[in-house]
């Protein structure tokens, strides 16, 4: 039996800059019942506060609802582990909510086979930003990637589209079925998961010409 090992805050994420969650790895419990508490302060402020909600985001987490989330302020967050033999505190984690956004994937993915005047066929991929993000006002600047592969292929082909919400894919094989997904990433933030898979078959009666 011993004091608890040092916990580590390993991840903080926000879906929308309005709420966020931080998760920690507990470290060893020293073979004893161990309590964990997360405390935080904000830069330039002297007060220290305890986690407002340990339940919403599951074990070893702290959820900050709208009421407790400020942007343009750096949070200094630590986790303390205590058992009857002693206590241990994590290194402080400095968090700016505007840098930890992991949005929902883009929505309304649409696929359309089109043909140019020279009879060259392409797949026109279009999508919309995730619902939660207010891209028009510049509250979020979003970058996108699409990935596609034929049903038989093992590897995805990834295209970075910048801020564009549409993309044309050329040199596809007639008669093949293609799977397509999109994801997005805000400035400074994290890539969303890949969105729902859509598929389309390139018709055989379109002829590809180089």
């Amino acid at each position: 039996q011993s004091p608890p090992g040092k916990p580590e805050i390993h991840k903080c994420r926000s879906p929308d800059k309005e709420t966020f969650t931080c998760w920690w790895n507990p470290g060893s419990d020293g073979g004893l019942p161990t309590n964990y508490s997360l405390t935080y302060s904000k830069e330039g402020e002297k007060n220290t506060y305890e986690c407002p909600d340990y339940k919403t985001s599951g074990p070893n987490s702290c959820f900050f609802s709208k009421q407790y989330t400020s942007i343009w302020k750096i949070y200094i967050i630590t986790v303390n582990a205590t058992n009857e033999m002693g206590s241990s505190t994590s290194d402080p984690l400095y968090v700016d909510v505007t840098y930890i956004v992991e949005p929902e994937p883009p929505r309304n993915l649409t696929l359309e086979v089109k043909q140019l005047k020279d009879k060259k066929t392409y797949l026109w991929v279009k999508w919309l930003p995730p619902t939660i993000t207010d891209v028009k006002t510049g509250w979020f600047t979003m970058e996108y990637e699409i990935r596609l592969k034929s049903e038989e292929a093992d590897e995805w082909e990834i295209h970075f589209t910048g801020h564009q919400t549409q993309f044309k894919v050329f040199d596809l094989y007639p008669g093949q079925k293609y799977l397509v997904q999109t994801r997005c990433k805000p400035d400074h933030g994290y890539w969303s998961r890949w969105g729902q898979e859509k598929s389309i078959e390139i018709p055989n009666d379109f002829t590809l010409k180089d």
Epitope: I74, D96, K185, Y190
Partner: antibody
Framework: QVQLQQPGAELVMPGSSVKLSCKAS????????MHWVKQRPGQGLEWIGE????????NYNQKFKDKATLTVDKSSSTAYMQLSSLTSEDSAVYYC?????????????WGQGTLVTVSA | DIVMTQSQKFMSTTVGDRVSITCKAS??????VAWYQQKPGQSPKLLIY???NRYTGVPDRFTDSGSGTDFTLTISNLQSEDLADYFC?????????FGGGTKLEIK
């Protein structure tokens, strides 16, 4: 405790490439962005670029876009920077530096630096 | 690119002095400025972030004032271990840039 381990020195030929390593320990490698900074003898500091070890997303200083390539190996918690087409201008100390938190780019932990000498 | 100018390359000081090191940004950077200390043969060490916040473990004799384009790192009651190079850095817009450094020397 947090440590960023870098080899002390590399002697390389002009025109060749070198791959510098930075082994991180004492924290979860994928949590923080890693940066690379150049310092020529007796001179100031120049930011080369940054990489997010969680997904290898990177940003570069345009000045180093064709010179440096940043990669990571999550399994060994190691960040790498490859420098290509080396000239005497590339002789410098190169530091890896960990982002201070989940936020803006200030650097709370630095490696000891690798001195790269480009010489025939 | 934003240029960070530290006009004093060298400053002669005495132990116990109050020293002010200045840094000027070529464009508005808000409070997105950090300060580092570098001793000979060592890597830089973070002192201040967000223009005025001392990093964990940094003695309170180090303070920063300023926002916008003009920043000053003040060391009160200078200690011999404070003799080093000091660099400012902006992280307001890419690429992140550093000042040229100010070296504190003994008179």
């Amino acid at each position: 405790q947090v440590q960023l381990q870098q080899p002390g020195a590399e002697l390389v030929m002009p025109g060749s490439s070198v791959k510098l390593s930075c082994k991180a320990s004492g924290y979860t490698f994928t949590t923080y962005w890693m940066h690379w900074v150049k310092q020529r003898p007796g001179q100031g500091l120049e930011w080369i670029g940054e990489i997010d070890p969680s997904d290898s997303y990177s940003n570069y200083n345009q000045k180093f876009k064709d010179k440096a390539t940043l990669t990571v190996d999550k399994s060994s918690s190691t960040a790498y920077m490859q420098l290509s087409s080396l000239t005497s201008e590339d002789s410098a100390v190169y530091y890896c530096a960990r982002n201070g938190g989940l936020g803006p780019a200030w650097f709370s932990y630095w490696g000891q630096g690798t001195l790269v000498t480009v010489s025939a | 690119d934003i240029v960070m100018t530290q006009s004093q390359k060298f400053m002669s000081t005495t132990v116990g002095d109050r020293v002010s090191i200045t840094c000027k940004a070529s464009q508005y950077v808000g409070t997105a400025v950090a300060w580092y200390q570098q001793k000979p043969g060592q890597s830089p060490k973070l002192l201040i972030y967000s223009a005025s916040n001392r990093y964990t473990g940094v003695p309170d004799r180090f303070t920063d004032s300023g926002s916008g384009t003009d920043f000053t790192l003040t060391i009160s009651n200078l200690q011999s271990e404070d003799l080093a190079d000091y660099f400012c850095q902006q992280y307001s817009s890419y690429p992140w840039t550093f000042g040229g450094g100010t070296k504190l020397e003994i008179k």
